[in-house]
């Protein structure tokens, strides 16, 4: 009733209230030094300290650097908001083999089901494509669009399709849009709105640069905003995103107020000495023998994985493929186990990491 | 009203250490970021780091990584800064400054401490 | 860190002319739509003294015909119309990435 706008408009005569026209309510004043999670906040766990750019705040209230994605093999999930890290994941075409916090330690590219399998789930950016062998009656060779080419003269075992392990692949790990692990454990200390950039996965482009508001003497509420590539730590300690500066890098996930930046190794590269939110080392995959050479697709978020072939029929690694060019990258092959009797029961995921030995053999990579 | 007092002029013998103070008032100490900005003699600003008094949490410019730390009394709202290992080249002019929540800028300055250093 | 460049090094302006200083950085300083670049005033034997924010935002208190502009890496500080009082060094300063860094600063006379 438009008798009670100017009653409403002072907010009962309530100093730390005031009404907002845009949604018709009244919305809690947040206290010099803090700024609203949203546009109208409701009581004080709306409101919080600003971090710098590309710093978010962390559970702790510590202003931490969000994560870079800017390795070549990484793309922006989600990015960099005052209360979640800037999440990275691989670029289409790739999936993560090794997560790391908002972002992947190191990306594959997708395996293409060898002769005689076809894609029975495409790859995503945290999982390798999924390979099944042929339907009978079907042509091998061109049951699938991937998959046209003829097959090798190796047998393909008739088993069934092998995912990617928990244990290599990301998907149990990796954050999902909506929110990062950071976000979500800090949701229990930080009230947000259902519109806050953790409930939506669509952080405010505001960062906290709005105008000055006022933080009251003894406010146990003020929290503090941390400088730009800086993000608010578990511990509530400002904290340096990672640099992802380094030639064989590439940003995964971006600087946010409350995550890091995370760093991997860029395409073509493996990382054999991680780093928190980065790698100290990335080395060139190894390339192996044309039965598990793999070639990049392009087709956006897939990967693969297939059974391993039979014991006896294992491809060592050739300096270079067929033509003798080296391919952009190659997938790990089956050649990694290391215990024949696993070989029999275990397929072994395209997604496992792998060192080359001093033979030029990939090893199994236990870091 | 807002204000910034720092402790008085310092002259210090190379290797020692010196600690700068910076009390303010009129204002809520803990919430907002508390910055420290050094000017050698007819030169330019250079940012030292700063502190946010509610946690102590700091940033540094890497510069002085090691030999600058600071600190803060919430219960005086007392800024300090701590640089040891003195060298001539410290020879400046120290100030405090509150930076503002919002645009980062540094709207509230103390009036300077002079520390020389000379054997 | 990231460099600023401040030019120039002395401005000779007569009473009433347009001075209009320039900061260039190394990188960017754009930040969610805005640029984290500051200028201050600094009078001999004062602190720094806040004029512009965020690149173009003219602090409180600060008279009109002061005015920042620029954007990514270039930006500028200019008086409209010298005042006596205007004769200072000035400083740019970015907020972008930490260290915090300032320009060499620019020396406003009186021609």
């Known amino acids: 009733f438009p008798q009670d706008r100017p009653f409403e408009d002072t907010c009962h005569g309530n100093p730390s209230h005031y009404y907002d026209k845009a949604v018709r309510r009244c919305c809690y004043r947040c206290p010099m030094g803090l700024f609203p999670t949203q546009q109208c906040p409701q009581r004080p766990t709306d409101c919080r300290k600003q971090c710098e750019p590309d710093y978010y705040l962390d559970e702790a209230d510590r202003c931490t650097a969000c994560v870079t994605c800017s390795r070549d093999d990484l793309v922006e999930k989600t990015p960099c908001a005052w209360n979640s890290s800037r999440v990275c994941e691989c670029r289409p075409g790739m999936f993560c083999s090794t997560s790391a916090v908002n972002s992947c330690a190191r990306c594959f590219f997708h395996s293409v089901c060898p002769a005689g399998m076809i894609v029975k789930f495409p790859g995503t950016a945290q999982k390798n494509t999924v390979c099944e062998p042929a339907s009978p009656g079907v042509s091998p060779a061109c049951a699938s669009p991937e998959n046209c080419k003829e097959p090798s003269s190796g047998t393909i075992p008739q088993a069934k399709p092998t995912p990617v392990s928990p244990a290599t692949s990301s998907a149990s790990t990796m954050p999902v849009r909506g929110g990062t692990r950071l976000a979500q454990e800090a949701a229990s200390k930080l009230t947000r709105a259902p519109d806050s950039p953790s409930s939506v996965g669509r952080p405010s482009s505001d960062p906290g640069l709005s105008p000055t508001q006022p933080c009251p003497e003894g406010s146990g509420d003020c929290r503090k905003q941390c400088e730009p590539d800086y993000y608010l730590d578990e511990a509530g300690r400002c904290t340096a995103c990672v640099s992802c500066s380094r030639d064989d890098l590439v940003e995964k996930t971006p600087c946010a107020w409350n995550s890091s930046r995370t760093c991997e190794c860029r395409p073509g590269m493996i990382c054999a000495t991680s780093a928190t939110n980065s790698c100290a080392r990335c080395v060139p995959y190894p390339i192996c023998a044309a039965e598990t050479v793999t070639k990049p697709q392009d087709m956006a978020e897939k990967d693969t994985t297939f059974e391993a072939p039979p014991l006896g029929t294992q491809p060592d690694c050739n300096p270079t493929p067929e033509n003798g060019e080296a391919p952009a990258s190659t997938s790990p092959t089956q050649s990694l186990l290391v215990d024949s009797q696993a070989s029999k029961t275990l397929p072994i995921p395209t997604s496992a990491p792998v060192a080359l030995s001093s033979t030029g053999k990939p090893v199994l990579d236990a870091g | 009203e807002v204000q910034l007092v720092q402790s008085g002029a310092e002259v210090k013998k190379p290797g020692s250490s010196v600690k700068v103070s910076c009390k303010a008032s009129?204002?809520?100490?803990?919430?907002?970021?508390m910055n420290w900005v050094r000017q050698a003699p007819g030169q330019g600003l250079e940012w030292m780091g700063q502190?946010?008094?509610?946690?102590?949490?700091?940033n540094y410019n890497g510069k002085f990584q090691g030999r600058v730390t600071l600190t803060a009394d919430k219960s005086t709202s007392t800024a300090y800064m701590e640089l040891s290992s003195l060298r001539s080249e410290d020879t400046a002019v120290y100030f405090c400054?509150?930076?503002?929540?919002?645009?980062?800028?540094?709207?509230?300055w103390g009036q300077g401490t002079l520390v020389t250093v000379s054997s | 860190e990231i460099v600023l460049t401040q030019s120039p090094d002395s401005l000779a302006v007569s009473l009433g002319e347009r001075a209009t200083i320039n900061c260039r950085a190394s990188?960017?300083?754009?930040?969610?739509?805005?640029?984290?670049m500051l200028w201050y005033q600094q009078k001999p034997g004062q602190p720094p003294k806040l004029l512009i924010y965020?690149?173009?935002n003219v602090e409180s208190g600060v008279p009109d015909r002061f005015s920042g502009s620029g954007s990514g890496t270039d930006f500028s500080l200019t008086i409209s119309s010298l005042e006596p009082e205007d004769i200072a060094m000035y400083f740019c300063?970015?907020?972008?990435?930490?260290?915090?860094?300032f320009g060499g600063g620019t020396k406003v006379e009186i021609k």
């Open positions: 400054a509150r930076r503002i929540n919002g645009n980062f800028a540094m709207d509230y």
């Open positions: 009129g204002y809520a100490f803990s919430s907002y970021w």
């Open positions: 502190i946010y008094p509610g946690d102590g949490d700091t």
């Open positions: 990188e960017s300083l754009e930040y969610y739509g805005t640029s984290l």
């Open positions: 965020s690149a173009s």
């Open positions: 300063q970015q907020r972008r990435k930490v260290p915090s860094t």
